[in-house]
């Protein structure tokens, strides 16, 4: 095959949005419909991603950039570039192979995605449970039990307001 060869690859002159066509003496041809090249010097164009089914189009494909997908309502993205859509669950649930299941006692999930996580063990930090956990919320830890000695209160109540002209009983 005859071709005059320069030291520089002639394909390097082809900009994004085109491809360097081997079959036409390495001329720069526009990417065909439904394809793109995001960098210069490519010998072919990449096929545009199609956002079908549970995916929906967040950004249309152009000759220089791929389409971007997100997920239809009731689903959320997983993986790089939203490669998968996973079903949402309610707070207090996690997604299993059999669908959304309530969190087991002692665990919680405060989001529509992800797994149920164990409540915080307050005693590991020497603290006590101030507010009990639920399926949707973690426990709230308070001061350590030692701080709550008899006669001591975790929250100091405000002093009663005195009325003018009255001395204390």
């Amino acid at each position: 095959f005859e071709r005059t060869r320069s030291l520089q690859d002639p394909c390097s002159n082809c900009p994004a949005g085109t491809f360097c066509d081997n079959n036409r003496n390495q001329i720069c041809s526009p990417c065909p419909p439904n394809s793109f090249s995001s960098a210069g010097g490519q010998r072919t164009c990449d096929i545009c991603r199609q956002c079908k089914g549970v995916f929906r189009t967040r950004k249309e494909c152009s000759s220089t950039s791929n389409a971007e997908c997100d997920c239809t309502p009731g689903f959320h993205c997983l993986g790089a570039g939203c490669s998968m859509c996973e079903q949402d669950c309610k707070q207090g649930q996690e997604l299993t192979k059999k669908g959304c299941k309530d969190c087991c006692f002692g665990t919680f999930n405060d989001q529509k995605r992800g797994i149920c996580r164990p409540w915080t063990n307050c005693s590991l930090d020497g603290k006590s449970v101030l507010v009990n956990g639920t399926k949707e919320r973690d426990v709230v830890c308070g001061p350590s039990p030692a701080d709550l000695s008899p006669g001591a209160s975790s929250v100091t109540p405000p002093a009663p307001a005195r009325e003018p002209g009255h001395s204390p009983q």
Epitope: N22, N23, P32, R43, T44, D46
Partner: antibody, heavy 123, light 107 residues
Amino acid sequence: QVQLVQSGAEVKKPGASVKVSCKASGYTFTSYWINWVRQAPGQGLEWMGNIYPSDSYTNYDQKFKDRVTMTRDTSTSTVYMELSSLRSEDTAVYYCTKSGEYGKIGYYAMDYWGQGTTVTVSS
Amino acid sequence: DIQMTQSPSSLSASVGDRVTITCRASQDISNYLNWYQQKPDKTVKLLIYYTSRLHSGVPSRFSGSGSGTDYTLTISSLQPEDIATYYCQQGNTLPYTFGQGTKLEIK
């Protein structure tokens, strides 16, 4: 479905010419390159050249460029490969192949192949 | 022209074996590497294009990998119908060139 149907076997004398046809169906004929690849007995595959049916643009391997001519007839979706000045070493099975989708990742692959045409050159 | 060198030139393996065929290009071919299967009846089919993309209808036991100058075709579990000769082909630069082929036989 894509089909490439080639003409029948040929026996030729040295110095003669042979013209092999390849009729395409099942896709848009003018939008895909057609390649010709040959295989001598007991040997590997050898690319001879290609043609773009839309405008008859051709590429020929240096080895064949003085003896090969590729043409097309869009009315019948047929591509022809003519090889002249035949010699015994041109005895081979000749395949036409369709290239992948224009400009896309499979563009430089040959995604469908004809059944092959045996050409025998013998005195 | 770009030279394509396949190895081995022939191999014998048992049904269920994992089989690997390699192809080396004389220069970088930027992943424009395709694999073909030629059956004993001389019919030829595309298996893999652009290094690793499976052509439609090709069983998933076939896979491809590689980059630069070195490429591999793998059959994860050899089947009796895989008896054939396998060819690599570069599509990076005209003229398109093929490896010399690897003849695969069943033990």
